[in-house]
Amino acid sequence: DVNEAPQFSQHVFQAKVSEDVAIGTKVGNVTAKDPEGLDISYSLRGDTRGWLKIDHVTGEIFSVAPLDREAGSPYRVQVVATEVGGSSLSSVSEFHLILMDVNDNPPRLAKDYTGLFFCHPLSAPGSLIFEATDDDQHLFRGPHFTFSLGSGSLQNDWEVSKINGTHARLSTRHTEFEEREYVVLIRINDGGRPPLEGIVSLPVTFCSCVEGSCFRPAGHKHHHHHH
């Protein structure tokens, strides 16, 4: 009669939790049985992020630190079931913690928008397109940002209009701009739960142009036109 190792009740174990669960929350559990009826002790292996602890007797798994989906999901650890007494045989399975995103990253510009310019003087109102993003996971649909000017005083000179969920157009309301840099503040709302807002700045230069590029004295780079 050969002593056999414990047998887990499932091939693997998974649990879905919100990434903002309180420390000490039960996030899942594992179960195994020993063919000889011996008691089983559970342990975790490979908890590299130090997020979890397991009850050695019940197999319940608890969070012991803040969880962060952006660190990678699912988070995978090994669970070990070991006979208590006997030959101390053990079996290994896996516990996968699936972290469901909470909206915890404010919107931001998708790339560096330095170097935006219009040739001065404007012959007609101009516009440029910009893109927003954030670091949250958007299950089943892309981000749906809304855009507005960041302060009321900007509304005399600029307007912002949404193109789609990630892109918007910034347009001048007139042609009477000075030959200088304007910093346009844009408010981006992600419409999440809870909604998060980012205020970003788009620096736009009105400058004299040579062959379609901003003229700069020696030592300054030419900027590229964006409208």
């Epitope: 091939h11 693997v12 998974q14 699912p74």
Partner: antibody, heavy 116, light 107 residues
Amino acid sequence: QVQLVQSGAEVKKPGASVKVSCKASGYSFSSYWMHWMRQAPGQGQEWMGYINPSTDYTEYNQKFKDRVTMTADKSTSTVYMELSSLRSEDTAVYYCARSRLGFDYWGQGTLVTVSS
Amino acid sequence: DIQMTQSPSSLSASVGDRVTITCRASENIDSYLAWYQHKEGKSPKLLLYAATVLADGVPSRFSGSGSGTDYTLTISSLQPEDFARYYCQHYYRTPLTFGQGTKLEIK
């Protein structure tokens, strides 16, 4: 990036054995179980079993238990699946796949043809 | 063994259509379910796991729902590259089993 590269196509006679290899790269080989599936012409996918490369623990589908052997060579990050006593109905494309929740990376498949 | 029954076995649809494929397990698999896309001559590609969670790099037009024994894969707006065979698979306990597949064809 993660890659699973399998050995080339094989033609075998009934009663013979075939050994298919699957070389892993781009991740920690011992950290993920490796499964084998097969798909016969006009049929669905069929799970054959898996190996845990860190412990060499294997578990096989009862259907293949007496004929299949899975092994792992940590020094080359390669797993092997050997199927013996081949018959014509073993003609199929054989796949290795890395296990996560489901199979997140698959080999390109190895066609094994059993014909007299 | 847990049987996975997929329906329909084949489906004709047009680009832009919304498509739904269902998968029924012979017993409760508690959302231990994955969906795959398989194109001729290629390896299967993981679309969703845990019934509802999109795998890395999978477009958001794919979504999954369900619990217990009944599960659904939905493609909200079919794209030309979505025409392929789709499989469900449970990983609740061994032996792991697949549905027989749904062939999605251009109408």
